[in-house]
Amino acid sequence: SGTTNTVAAYNLTWKSTNFKTILEWEPKPINQVYTVQISTKSGDWKSKCFYTADTECDLTDEIVKDVKQTYLARVFSYPAGHVESTGSTEEPPYENSPEFTPYLETNLGQPTIQSFEQVGTKVNVTVQDEWTLVRRNDTFLSLRDVFGKDLIYTLYYWKSSSSGKKTAKTNTNEFLIDVDKGENYCFSVQAVIPSRRTANRKSTDSPVECMGHEKGESRE
């Protein structure tokens, strides 16, 4: 039999951050290889990662075609050294992944504070707009391009001499906050998609940036 001693994959898991999307599964192969197929609910199956001994497959190129679609993947198990033969009619064992909707489920990557500039008692803090592999008209889109106003940033800011964190929010990538003159402040940002109701609605915090370091600029 063409599928003797092959084990079906299990624990199929989507790992996705800022739309970079990898399907992972188990077990580590012993005398077998895998091929992955992906499709939308209404589309045809497309094969990827042919006869791989890996237990992961990068499906980013497929899901970025329409990040609002819902995708399903499946992993086929074949004997090691398997060569596709036209005469084979036996379907190899396979396992389906959970459904995955990138727009709703991709994790938000850790944001970065690009710069901050103080003018008197105002500070303008700018969050770096991350590029994704999502394209429109042959142009790569930023996270802001993809999510639009669905994506907000929360800024935590505090006096270097104090522990209490004030907050500000924006649906752009810029904050303009009031600060006390002569005080140094530290900043950290968090990306949030408030419309999500699941565990992936917030990113991890950006690295903390403080005034008096190279990212900032001060003008009277």
């Epitope: 964190k165 907050t167 565990a199 917030k202």
Partner: antibody
Amino acid sequence: EVQLVESGGGLVQPGGSLRLSCAASGFTINNYIIHWVRQAPGKGLEWVGYIDPSNGYTYYADSVKGRFTISADTSKNTAYLQMNSLRAEDTAVYYCARDPQSLSSPFDYWGQGTLVTVSS
Amino acid sequence: DIQMTQSPSSLSASVGDRVTITCRASQDVNTAVAWYQQKPGKAPKLLIYSASFLYSGVPSRFSGSRSGTDFTLTISSLQPEDFATYYCQQHYTTPPTFGQGTKVEIK
């Protein structure tokens, strides 16, 4: 169903301590901000402080700074308000409320409140 | 801190009346203002967010508006269940602050 349930209120002497709990269900506190708000008898609403359980960040009203501490245990899906050096003016119903951290970010769900009475 | 000055502190009205409550912010808060309704012995309930957006499940007789730093809550036709205390709140900056409250009583 989203629910917040406060507990731990009671009668305490001036200078004493009390710890209030805010148990959340129907959502994970790690993904939201939790605020504490109080209301003295016959008075208006006064914001006490907040915690972002995902990073532990907090901020307090000047009236409680240095005396009150907000914490969270994400494994228990519960936020806490530790109140020390209590004064008569801290007598109030204490509410916890959820902040969805949206741009408009109002407090969309509130607990039923727990009464704290500071009296000798 | 931003002050929210709410007026009137109380008002008497009849069922069917149009009721208007105002809040003035001491500085710009954009549209980051919410309105809450509170009944005796109960927690506040969100009515309006972002100055003018009706929260889900809230009857359409409630509406909110903004003019600069002035914010208004309007009840177009007061119902028996609307007799309560109403609070505005700004959440533009930390700390978030509440108005003093307006008690709507039966005339």
